[in-house]
């Protein structure tokens, strides 16, 4: 018994004064203990507790069941125990079957021996089956047997407890090992949309999904800078053994341009945490923005090629889009699509192919879109550079020779005087008279000039060339006349086109 | 300081028996498991059998179950191992050892962590 310096409380001793004592079943269990201060007797095996306030602890008959730890305790709480075996051959093990084991942890398997003096008290696997090779297990009698540094992989694993007895392994019932996996990564979470564009008024659903080795991941949605509880609703499923789902929904059934922002949704288990994000924005009605993708006064050759091309965001998705030109609409010609295919995409792209343009197919071109809220447009004004055509060339009765061109741009008109026969006209002859007329055609058109110059300042016979140009190139006309005497022959005008 | 002192070996023929004694000296170990282990020439040393010095469980490894018997006299303070049908395979110098931490790997292989060790004795099986 324990020995203690004078005037210190000693703890109770105990009769009789072993540590382990083994009886027979059916045989007296009589304990006494022995303490001035003395307050109970408690039993205890598995999870099974019982008290007693006598100081001598009598079972008459002793039961299996009876196994356990007996521990006096007087009034200072210092207690004594002496551990009792009841030899029942009918009942080697004393049997808890749960069994729960935290990975890389022990966990115990409850199979208490009722008789210590046993051989090789080990595991065994069910059915014959050999245990992983790795499992490693410290035997005790008095609280069962603990397997070490419990594996993921011996989950589900059968077991027993067993003793060897005349050469036979007698078993436990059987024990089946569940295993709570430990968290070795952070939690996965990814989110149904990465953004959300919704008018007021109209619900916002979002879902997380979080992915982890078992339910035990904690999960939250937040606002970010807000500390405000959100509404969500939970989904979970587990897919095989450590493969836990949880889908985690939050919603604001009538959303408000308030509560536009980023909303987290954050995870975390014992080894970390992981979060993502959505953004919310809530606008009070729908719009429709263009942008056009070249400039909307544009310049073409007559002839050539041109795309009108437009982006443009529409929220809510884009109901009508139509080009226009004088009033007509393009049934084809024009190509209109998204510009991407992502599910939160509000950007879309609008073209309109014009192919071979005439002069007279210059003009304001007019893209139109609308949506459910909001209708919006934008003009393309259209110039086709057309080169100079001269449509009237006259000796006037007031002997002025007059030209009459029109391209676009404008052209200019020069004058040029050939003496004789020469082909070469050099001189240049100064107009009397230039002006732009105004064209009767559409506007972007071309435009229309007049020039005229004095004949009767020409003194010998010759050619007299009229040569409209602009930029894109040049068209001449020319005026012959002779002398007869004093008098002038009646012009013979005819045109030359230079390409 | 505790002493382990084995004693008992010698040369036998196969099919007889022998018994080794381990007097334990120093203190008494009672929740301790008192073991035998043996070494062969260039082999490792293997578990052989153990009991429990207060609780007298006992354990054996596979090649000797049925063939070998551990046992202790707590008034004598000695552990004995009772060799019955000797191999040659049996030839070995056996070591006497003491610890408080026995355990079982993949239910058939046993190990100790012996905190106390003994000199040894051989014991050869002629054939």
């Known amino acids: 018994q324990p020995s203690v310096s004078p005037g210190e409380p000693s703890p109770p001793s105990i009769h009789p004064g072993k540590s382990d004592l083994i009886v027979r079943v059916g045989d007296e269990i009589r304990l006494l203990c022995t303490d001035p201060g003395f307050v109970k007797w408690t039993f205890e095996i598995l999870d099974e507790t019982n008290e007693n306030k006598q100081n001598e602890w009598i079972t008459e008959k002793a039961e299996a069941t009876n196994t356990g730890k007996y521990t006096c305790t007087n009034k200072h709480g210092l207690s004594n125990s002496i551990y009792v075996f009841v030899r029942d051959p009918a009942k080697l093990f004393l049997v808890d079957r749960s069994l729960y084991g935290k990975e890389d942890n022990d966990t115990l398997v409850r199979c208490p021996l009722t008789d210590p003096e046993v051989t090789n008290y080990s595991l065994k696997g069910c059915q014959g089956k050999p245990l992983p090779k790795d499992l490693r297990f410290i035997p005790d009698p008095k609280a069962g047997i603990m397997i070490k540094s419990v594996k993921r992989a011996y989950h589900r694993l059968c077991l027993h407890c067993s003793v060897d007895q005349e050469g036979k392994s007698v078993l436990s019932e059987k024990f089946i090992l569940k295993v709570r996996p430990a968290f070795k990564a952070v939690p996965v979470v990814s989110v149904s949309k990465a953004s959300y564009l919704l008018r007021e008024g109209e619900e916002f659903t979002v879902t997380c999904t979080i992915k982890d080795v078992s339910s035990s991941v904690y999960s939250t949605w937040k606002r970010e800078n807000s500390q405000t509880k959100l509404q969500e609703k939970y989904n979970s499923w587990h897919h095989g053994d450590f493969n836990y789902e949880r889908q985690a929904t939050l919603t604001i059934s009538s959303a408000r341009v308030n509560d536009s922002g980023v909303f987290m949704c954050y995870a975390n288990n014992t080894f970390g945490s992981a979060n993502v994000t959505t953004t919310l924005e809530v606008v009070d009605k729908g719009f429709i923005n263009i942008f056009p993708m070249i400039n909307t006064t544009v310049f073409v050759n007559d002839g050539e090629n041109v795309d009108l091309i437009v982006e443009y965001e529409a929220f809510p998705k884009p109901e009508h889009q139509q080009w226009i030109y004088m009033n007509r609409t393009f049934t084809d010609k024009w190509e209109d699509y998204p510009k991407s295919e992502n599910e939160s995409n509000i950007r879309y792209v609008s073209e309109l192919h014009l192919t071979r343009l005439k002069g007279t197919e210059g003009g304001t071109y007019t893209f139109l879109v609308s949506n459910s809220d909001v209708n919006a447009a934008i003009a393309f004004n259209v110039y086709v550079n057309t080169k100079p055509e001269i449509l009237t060339y006259d000796r006037l009765v007031n002997g002025m020779l007059q030209c009459v061109a029109a391209g676009f741009p404008e052209p200019t008109i020069d004058w040029y005087f050939c003496p004789g026969t020469e082909q070469r006209c050099s001189a240049s002859v100064l107009p009397v008279d230039v002006q732009t007329l105004n064209s009767s055609g559409p506007p972007f058109g071309k435009l229309v000039v007049q020039s005229s110059i004095d004949s009767s300042a020409f003194k010998h016979n010759g050619t007299v060339e009229c040569k409209a140009y602009n930029d894109v190139g040049k068209t001449s006309a020319y005026f012959n006349f002779a002398f007869k005497g004093n008098n002038k022959e009646q012009i013979h005008p005819h045109t030359l086109f230079t390409p | 300081q505790v002493q382990l002192v084995e004693s008992g070996g010698g040369l036998v023929q196969a099919g007889d028996s022998l018994r080794l004694s381990c007097a334990v000296s120093g203190r008494t170990l009672s929740n301790y498991f008192m073991a035998w282990l043996r070494q062969a020439p260039g082999k490792e040393r293997e578990f052989v059998a153990a009991i429990h010095w207060s609780l007298g469980s006992t354990y054996y490894q596979d090649p000797v179950k049925g063939r070998f018997t551990i046992s202790r006299d707590k008034a004598k303070n000695t552990v004995y191992l009772q060799m019955n049908t000797l191999k040659p395979e049996d030839t070995a110098t056996y070591i006497c050892?003491?610890?408080?931490?026995?355990?079982?790997?993949?239910?058939?292989?046993?190990?100790?962590?012996?905190?106390?060790w003994g000199q040894g004795t051989q014991v050869t099986v002629s054939s």
């Open positions: 050892a003491a610890g408080q931490h026995l355990s079982g790997l993949g239910g058939s292989a046993w190990s100790i962590e012996g905190d106390y």
